[in-house]
């Protein structure tokens, strides 16, 4: 799609024919439906200069008008060589995906002085992109806001109404503001400066592929990778795969490696597939049954027949006409094509192209190196194709940039700055000194010397939005596919050995022994009415109260001699006063001074794929929720067994918490999910679990001083 909306009409659609082979190794093919523009460089420059504020009126067209002064302005603003010419560096910049906010001037004249006059900023996520799981989107936005709150006095609170200061919306084309998006690439997002109504709002082009900057995010199920996302591309049997594959399996289930190399790392999971589960419908998430009969016809794949909305569905029994049971087929982000002449269809592997078979996306036949696939099994006869998903754009980075605008920042001319208009993927710290100086010019620095994450008090929505689809129920273990592409992986380490004998020694005091200097605790638990914090063989006790400080450190070995130095999680069962200590694949249960264990997690009904228990929450009388990575189970304390049918995914029960928490604990009737030095606090009201605060464990729970 063209970067410049007014030029949509001059796109050239190429016919369905092959080009004469060029004198080079691979044949170049003209793909039907491939959109190319016949824009001259000058036309492109005129549109760009006007759209982004370098020329005042759209009529500044025609060869007679010199673009020199405007080009100089642009080159100065974007820190390009100031030639005043339409040179290759300038053209390259003009073709780079970017923010839609003009560099000079604004969308329009706004009222007010374009900063917020209160520091507790609220935001509402009005809708979602389907490119990423909702929890990942929530997290990306929370982290983007946290960048700005870390360097200013601002806090960011998620709310559930359009009364929010900042409304976040995914939209396509004309999406309700008079500044239409332009299809894939080009213009990625835009935001308005602070103020009422549309002012302060941030809009993201949903024709982009939103990711975390490194390819589509495909969460896996089962396998041995604990729900980790696919890693694209990955190596399997020496070949590179850029999408989920059924290679190496006889059951047709698509899978992927969750690391770059399956051959060396052996980590994998199953990709969303209608052969694994369906969504919504009326069949309780059961997988598709192929073939199935619908209106007397046989179907061996998901279909949109019988529906006007284009949703793919299938029957979950052999005969829909008789049983009327169906579900919707999960979307396969890894192999849903974009552009071409089959947008939205799935790649079909293997497919035949120029007589050769391909079981992964290819750039053969193209001169631009872009990966593509056929959407039927034979491109040569059907000519149906589309582009394979690319790296996508980091929602976190683009959001952080747009939120800068929503707080009142203009574009920066420093190429390394977050507020530079062009998209640039980086895994380093996003904020540049220029960004920090700009935002502090508006709001001043944080009163505390130490940066802190946002406080996100989440008020109850007046009517909770329907989350559709909420996702299928977890597949019962007996229905699970076999463990891996080439058989079950060998069992991982059984966990650390128990600590050797120890004598009761006083711990020599050093700065490390102050709980306030501990960055990340191994485990935290409420025992009795105190909070216990464990780290490297030591623990502290903390009682809430004005001016109270954590007491300790004490040696774990003095109080619980059987335990190892490193704990993953701890909890107290209130009725029996039993203490459960988890480390690796082992658990110890203390009742007073007597200990049972170490016992393997298998004894609790947790399979070999559960490497550790990362936390626990109370869940009714004598019941707990046990967490491991992205999964959780219901645990009967008396029976000391998990209910295998209760397995669920954390982000379904606790939307908005990070996906990679290392500790989950309960304190004062609220749930805390720890990631790095931060916690996400969840309160449960009328059966809705909602993040109501994000903070530092040390400053906000332990009340540590911030100097």
């Amino acid at each position: 799609m063209s970067l410049w909306q007014p030029l949509v009409l001059v796109l050239l659609v190429l016919g369905c024919c092959f080009a004469a082979p060029r004198q080079r190794q691979s044949t170049l093919v003209l793909f039907p439906g491939d959109l190319r523009t016949n824009l001259t460089d000058r036309q492109l420059a005129e549109e760009y200069l006007y759209r982004y504020g370098y020329t005042r009126v759209a009529e500044m067209r025609g060869e007679s008008k010199s673009l020199g002064p405007a080009l100089l302005l642009l080159q100065k603003q974007l820190s390009l060589p100031e030639t005043g010419e339409l040179d290759s560096a300038t053209l390259k910049a003009m073709r780079t995906p970017r923010c839609g906010v003009p560099d000079l001037g604004r969308f329009q004249t706004f009222e007010g002085d374009l900063k917020w006059h209160h520091h507790n900023i609220t935001y509402w996520i009005q809708n979602y992109s389907e490119d990423l799981p909702r929890a990942v989107i929530d997290d990306a936005f929370a982290r983007a806001f946290a960048l700005w709150s870390a360097v200013t006095p601002l806090t960011f609170t998620r709310v559930y109404s359009r009364d929010a200061d900042i409304v976040i919306q995914f939209g396509v084309a004309e999406h309700g503001d008079g500044y239409p998006f332009d299809g894939k690439d080009g213009l990625l997002a835009h935001a308005f400066p602070p103020g009422p109504g549309i002012q302060g709002d941030a809009h993201f082009d949903d024709d982009e592929l939103w990711s975390l900057g490194k390819g589509v995010v495909v969460p896996t199920r089962f396998g041995n990778a604990d729900g980790a996302a696919c890693h694209f591309p990955f190596i399997f049997e020496g070949r590179s795969y850029s999408a989920c594959t059924t290679d190496g399996r006889s059951d047709g289930l698509p899978w992927c490696s969750t690391t770059a190399n399956y051959d060396t790392d052996d980590r994998f999971g199953f990709c969303p597939s209608e052969r694994l589960y369906t969504q919504d419908g009326n069949a309780d998430g059961k997988p598709c049954q192929f073939p199935f009969i619908f209106q007397g016809q046989s179907y061996s794949a998901c279909t949109t027949d019988g529906r006007s909305d284009g949703y793919r569905w299938c029957a979950t029994t052999a005969n829909y006409d008789r049983d009327k049971l169906f579900g919707f087929c999960p979307t396969r982000a890894d192999s849903t094509v974009m552009g071409g002449n089959s947008a939205g269809e799935l790649c079909v592997f293997p497919f035949t192209f120029l007589g050769k078979e391909y079981s992964t996306c290819t750039s053969e036949g193209r001169g631009d190196g872009r990966l593509w696939c056929a959407t039927t099994s034979n491109f040569d006869s059907d000519k149906k194709w589309g582009f394979c998903p690319d790296q996508g754009y980091s929602l976190f980075l683009v959001a952080a940039h747009e939120f800068g605008h929503a707080l009142g920042l203009d574009h920066s001319s420093v190429p390394e700055a977050l507020m530079y208009p062009m998209y640039r993927f980086t895994e380093g710290p996003p904020l540049h000194k220029d960004d920090v100086n700009g935002i502090r010019h508006l709001y001043g620095p944080r009163p505390e010397p130490e940066p802190r994450p946002p406080t996100t008090t989440t008020p109850q929505p007046t009517a909770p939005p329907t989350v559709c689809p909420t996702g299928p129920p977890t597949v019962h273990p007996s229905e699970r596919p076999t463990a891996g592409p080439t058989g079950p992986p060998s069992a991982g380490p059984t966990g650390p050995p128990t600590a050797g004998p120890s004598t009761a020694t006083t711990v020599p005091l050093s700065p490390v022994d102050d709980a306030c200097n501990v960055n990340i605790f191994d485990a935290i638990a409420e025992i009795g009415n105190q909070l216990y914090l464990f780290k490297d063989g030591k623990y502290w006790r903390f009682s809430e109260g004005r001016g109270s400080r954590p007491q300790g450190p004490f040696l774990i070995a003095d109080k619980w001699p059987a335990l190892p130095r490193k704990l993953d999680s701890v909890f107290e069962e209130r009725l029996s006063k039993k203490l459960f200590f988890f480390s690796g694949r082992q658990v110890w249960v203390y009742t007073g001074a007597s200990v049972l264990g170490p016992r393997r997690l298998d004894k609790l009904g947790l399979g070999a794929d559960v490497a550790q228990v990362t936390g626990a929450l109370r869940s009714g009388r004598g019941k707990m929720l046990l967490f491991s990575g992205r999964r959780l189970w219901r645990f009967d304390v008396k029976a000391q067994m998990v209910d295998p049918r209760s397995a669920s995914e954390v982000d379904r029960m606790f939307p908005g918490v990070p996906l990679d928490t290392h500790d989950v604990f309960q304190y004062r009737e609220k749930a805390y999910f720890c990631q790095d030095r931060f916690y996400w606090r969840v309160s449960s009201r009328s059966e809705l679990n909602q993040v109501d605060q994000v903070g530092y464990v040390t400053y906000d729970i332990l009340q540590c001083p911030e100097d």
Partner: antibody
Framework: QVQLKESGPGLVAPSQSLSITCTVS????????VHWVRQPPGKGLEWLGV???????NYNSALMSRLSISKDDSKSQVFLKMNSLQTDDTAIYYC?????????WGQGTSVTVSS | DIVMTQSHKFMSTSVGDRVSITCKAS??????VAWYQQKTGQSPKLLIY???YRNTGVPDRFTGSGSGTDFTFTISSVQAEDLAVYFC?????????FGGGTKLEIK
């Protein structure tokens, strides 16, 4: 508080043009889009068009050739102009503020097309 | 243009009853549906926006749900003052379009 008020001619002869002014208070046209909607007697609501904060417009495709919407931000006024009126253009014409739904409406101005 | 279809032109109900009005979009409009109430001789009033969010000051007996193409507006316990015509509207893509309306009659 937020208010919108339409003022129009009431009676228009067939083939003539219609001009309605929507005067707003309590909010800025720089922060909210304004939509026009009409309702023929005893019938449903028909969306006519919108003018967004920056002045761009979108129209009902069936009426696009006859419709024009403009505004004067400083006077807080939005204008609807419609050409070549016929009897089936008889309706109550409303302007409404938009922000994820039309949250404030004018009381409407009744337009009768008759000779 | 997207067509919004309200299958029932009229619905009859009694005070205290639960009533649901449905609206179907001719193509996916995500969650961008609003519901309006219009009483005789009055301008329409926004009740629900973005499919499921109640507008400020709207009683909690009014709820909305749905996403994609199928949307439902529900009054959990009908009151006499709920006698009105209810319209759905999509604001996903211009031209924005309304459903034909459902007139709620109280027995």
């Amino acid at each position: 508080q937020v208010q919108l008020k339409e003022s129009g001619p009431g009676l228009v002869a067939p083939s003539q043009s219609l001009s309605i002014t929507c005067t707003v208070s309590g909010f800025s046209l720089l922060s909210y889009g304004v939509h026009w909607v009409r309702q023929p007697p005893g019938k449903g609501l028909e969306w006519l068009g919108v003018i967004w904060t920056g002045g761009t417009t979108n129209y009902n495709s069936a009426l696009m050739s006859r419709l024009s919407i403009s505004k004067d931000d400083s006077k807080s006024q939005v204008f609807l102009k419609m050409n070549s009126l016929q009897t089936d253009d008889t309706a109550i014409y409303y302007c409404a503020r938009y922000y994820y739904g039309m949250d404030y409406w004018g009381q409407g101005t009744s337009v009768t097309v008759s000779s | 243009d997207i067509v919004m279809t309200q299958s029932h032109k009229f619905m009859s109900t009694s005070v205290g009853d639960r009533v649901s009005i449905t609206c179907k979009a001719s193509q996916d409009v995500r969650n961008t549906v609003a519901w309006y109430q219009q009483k005789t001789g009055q301008s329409p009033k926004l009740l629900i926006y973005s499919s499921s969010y109640r507008n400020t000051g709207v009683p909690d007996r009014f709820t909305g749900s749905g996403s994609g193409t199928d949307f439902t507006f529900t009054i959990s316990s009908v009151q006499a003052e709920d006698l009105a015509v209810y319209f759905c509207q999509q604001h996903y893509i211009t031209p924005y379009t309304f459903g034909g309306g459902t007139k709620l009659e109280i027995k």
